[in-house]
């Protein structure tokens, strides 16, 4: 049974050229966490963290993806493109997957705030 | 407290392969992962390749696939290491390793270090 | 694969000197350095990871720091245990690669 839930940074806002964290974290469960993907709303992968190999973020996103913080991404040199849904999906075992979505909202303003609370989606 | 304890040095013939031992013990040995170093020359070190002794997962160094083969028997907390067709290049010092923790790739213990000589 | 390139190779100080050990990744590793002491006939012992985070029961005596590509292990007041050899390892993501070494002898 599948008793842990996923807590994310929720809907987030920043402004454009700026940067972000992506954060998730898992709770309520015993189950050892695998891996962790991040991937956009097209459902690109944009980077991995597994247990035993580390990171890799993809190329294509090199130049604006950081690891970190912990099991976190962040987010670079923000455009309007990256405005969308973002997810991190738990691999863990013995549970199996969990998914936690972010919504991003990147503005042009320059009195944009980053704004950021952790929900259970 | 954390132990890795190799197998003794060996003298071994060139075309010659070979199974270097590390026990492990003061931890559950399926819940961390082992890795292999290679210390040529008493300088450089090389990373070989890991094993998950939970599910006998592996990854190698591309350098190391068809010369090293990992294995582990969770029945005596042993992980394994088999050295193919050894030649003067092999000659070296091998360590187990086991990382710090999950997600924390360093390597916080290490084996005393095996010593193997190829010659004929 | 990443290369990780140690400066010097060697060098000579005194007991109470302070010395400095770099290690440059060819690529950018963010934070994810870890740095060893190994001494004659003995296994690699881990010194510092995170670039700068101390390993329990090293003496404060050692700190890391650096980040992206760039990274140094400062030893103040040099006392007669710290001679060995030093290694930098990058933990960002396999294969792990190592520097070549540091070799540091008592003057």
């Known amino acids: 049974m599948m008793t842990g839930t996923i807590e994310t940074t929720g809907n987030i806002s920043a402004k454009k050229g700026g940067s972000v964290i992506l954060q998730c974290h898992l709770s309520s469960t015993m189950a050892q966490v695998t891996q962790v993907n991040w991937e956009q709303h097209d459902h690109s992968l944009l980077a991995i963290r597994n247990a035993e190999l580390g990171w890799h973020i993809y190329p294509a996103f090199k130049d604006r993806v950081a690891p970190g913080p912990g099991l976190g991404l962040t987010l670079q040199s923000l455009t309007m493109n990256d405005t969308g849904e973002y997810f991190c999906t738990y691999h863990t075992y013995p549970d199996g997957t969990y998914r936690g979505r972010i919504f991003l909202e990147v503005l042009e303003s320059s009195v944009a705030e980053h704004s950021a609370r952790f929900q259970i989606p | 407290e954390v132990k890795l304890v190799e197998s003794g040095p060996e003298l071994v013939k060139p075309g010659a392969s070979m199974k270097i031992s590390c026990k492990a013990s003061g931890y559950s040995f399926t819940g961390y992962t082992m890795n292999w170093v290679k210390q040529s020359h008493g300088k450089n070190l090389e990373w070989i390749g890991l094993?998950?002794?939970?599910?006998?997962?592996?990854s190698y160094n591309q350098k190391f696939k068809g010369k090293a083969t990992l294995t582990v028997d969770k029945s005596s907390s042993t992980a394994y290491m088999e050295l193919l067709s050894l030649t003067s290049e092999d000659s070296a010092v091998y360590y187990c390793?086991?990382?710090?923790?999950?997600?924390?790739?360093?390597?916080?213990?290490w084996g005393q270090g095996t010593l193997v000589t190829v010659s004929s | 694969d990443i290369q990780m390139t140690q400066s010097p190779a060697s060098l000579s100080a005194s007991v109470g000197e302070t010395v400095t050990i770099t290690c440059r990744a060819s690529?950018?590793?963010?934070?994810?350095l870890a740095w060893y002491q190994q001494k004659q006939g003995k296994s690699p012992q881990l010194l510092v990871y995170?670039?700068?985070t101390l390993a329990e029961g090293v003496p404060s005596r050692f700190s890391g720091s650096g980040s992206g590509t760039q990274f140094s292990l400062k030893i103040n007041s040099l006392q007669p245990e710290d001679f060995g050899s030093y290694y930098c390892?990058?933990?960002?993501?396999?294969?792990?690669?190592f520097g070549g070494g540091t070799k540091l002898e008592i003057k």
């Open positions: 390793a086991r990382y710090a923790n999950r997600f924390e790739n360093w390597f916080a213990y």
């Open positions: 690529e950018n590793i963010y934070s994810y």
């Open positions: 094993i998950n002794p939970y599910n006998g997962g592996t």
């Open positions: 390892q990058h933990h960002y993501g396999t294969p792990w690669t």
């Open positions: 995170n670039a700068k």
